[in-house]
């Protein structure tokens, strides 16, 4: 099954994560070739018999694509000539997780690299003051997470404090029966302090900060994918 008389070319991939229901990117680059028609890109997945995607002679070749990927893949055709073989995966499914191989053939030779792709759900948390509560309370909400994350509260003033006794976290299954809405409530909040709601699973870590003063409320949030250089 091997090509005879060809040299090896360098192919580089980056481990990444996909957000269920959204589009994802599987990153792959290679030593470019001067002629687009000489470049063949094949994406394969461990456990899947057919191809995930094939690009050859300057266009997508979807004839041998496995059923589970039909209609969901594309390469960045205009960037192939400069060595970008990254794959766009539409409507990421939980089952898309696994080991992928980016396999490249050019006039210079052939090469391949594996990529670990994780799938789950992750979203930015939003922290608000809960004015309906009897005492000063903060409410941290994030619409979509999977697998079930951990939620930890922290405070700038009381660094290292354990807020588990004064917080309550619930997970509510969303309508598609996979992802969950995360709601965490922190009680006995003091004014002139910055609180952080940190949500984390094995795919992503997200933080929502809120600074409450007498005159204003400032919010900030950020999300970071874990085990990924992307």
């Amino acid at each position: 099954f091997g090509i005879s008389g060809r040299h090896s070319i360098t192919v580089t991939t980056v481990a990444s994560a996909g957000n269920i229901g959204e589009d994802g990117i599987l990153s792959c680059t290679f030593e470019p070739d001067i002629k687009l028609s000489d470049i063949v890109i094949q994406w394969l997945k461990e456990g899947v018999l057919g191809l995930v995607h094939e690009f050859k002679e300057g266009k997508d070749e979807l004839s041998e694509q496995d059923e589970m990927f039909r209609g969901r893949t594309a390469v960045f055709a205009d960037q192939v000539i400069v060595g970008n073989a990254s794959l766009r995966l539409k409507n990421v499914q939980l089952t898309d997780a696994g080991t992928y191989k980016c396999y490249i053939i050019t006039s210079k030779g052939k090469g391949n690299a594996n990529l670990e792709y994780k799938t789950g759900a992750f979203s930015m948390p939003e922290v608000n003051v809960d004015y309906n509560a009897s005492s000063e309370t903060l409410r941290c909400e994030a619409p979509r997470w999977f697998p079930q994350p951990t939620v930890v509260w922290a405070s700038q003033v009381d660094q290292g404090a354990n807020f588990s006794e004064v917080s309550n976290t619930s997970f509510e299954l969303n309508s598609e029966n996979v992802t969950m809405k995360v709601v965490s409530v922190l009680y006995n909040v003091t004014i002139n302090n910055t609180y952080s709601c940190m949500i984390e699973n094995d795919i992503a870590k997200a933080t929502g900060d809120i600074k409450v003063t007498e005159s204003e409320i400032k919010r900030r949030s950020h999300l970071q994918l874990l085990n990924s250089k992307a």
Partner: antibody
Framework: QVQLVQSGAEVKKPGSSVKVSCKAS????????IHWVRQAPGQGLEWMGG????????KYAQNFQGRVTITADESTSTAYMELSSLRSEDTAVYYC?????????WGQGTTVTVSS | DIVMTQSPDSLAVSLGERATINCKSS????????????LAWYQQKPGQPPKLLIY???TRGSGVPDRFSGSGSGTDFTLTISSLQAEDVATYFC?????????FGQGTKVEIK
């Protein structure tokens, strides 16, 4: 020009196993699927399963699940099909074939006879 | 599983005459994004492996004479031999490769009348 060359005919006892090889020659590469199809005497074609050699990913027909094992050795460009717990109904010609817009290249076939 | 049904089971045609074989699938083999039907036709002569004649329901395989043609879409397909030659005596099979398990029709034996 790609060629698939299969191992020779086998005579086996009921309950035993048979392993048929299929060697690829010519300018092909690892990302073609190799499938196995059998044909009992005077009967039609029956798909048994296939393999993607680059990952060793396999898929089997329900009828053969648990009895058939398809493997591939990239270093020798050879695919193998092993069928266990043989019975007389397994007497057939076994073909390997490359999947490419259907099955465009076939091995010459290996006759397996199961007889006590 | 997709069931493939061929008709007739056997066919006797005079040399130079047209032979027509039908194949019906239990579900559509048309994949709209590429507008192709995942159907192939094979010819098998006694003691030989099958030979790919037609793929994508209507594209002739390498070195296949142009008297062989395939047509149809969705669930109904036809293989036509426009002018039967002596060397065309064989059994013909249709096959779907739209999804696994890959399935074949039961075969149609073509003989000379």
């Amino acid at each position: 020009q790609v060629q698939l060359v299969q191992s020779g005919a086998e005579v086996k006892k009921p309950g035993s196993s048979v392993k048929v090889s299929c060697k690829a020659s010519g300018d092909t590469f690892t990302t073609y699927q190799i499938h196995w199809v059998r044909q009992a005497p005077g009967q039609g074609l029956e798909w048994m399963g296939g393999i993607m050699p680059i990952f060793g990913t396999t898929k089997y027909a329900q009828n053969f699940q648990g009895r058939v094992t398809i493997t591939a050795d990239e270093s020798t460009s050879t695919a193998y099909m092993e069928l266990s717990s043989l019975r007389s109904e397994d007497t057939a010609v076994y073909y390997c074939a490359r999947r490419n817009y259907g099955m465009d290249v076939w091995g010459q076939g290996t006759t397996v006879t199961v007889s006590s | 599983d997709i069931v493939m049904t061929q008709s007739p089971d056997s066919l006797a045609v005079s040399l130079g005459e047209r032979a027509t074989i039908n194949c019906k699938s239990s579900q559509s083999l048309l994949y709209r994004p590429v507008n192709k039907n995942f159907l192939a036709w094979y010819q098998q002569k006694p003691g030989q492996p099958p030979k790919l004649l037609i793929y994508w329901a209507s594209t002739r395989g390498s070195g296949v004479p142009d008297r062989f043609s395939g047509s149809g879409s969705g669930t109904d397909f036809t293989l036509t031999i426009s002018s039967l030659q002596a060397e065309d005596v064989a059994t013909y099979f249709c096959q779907q490769y739209y999804s696994t398990p890959i399935t074949f029709g039961q075969g149609t034996k073509v003989e000379i009348k």
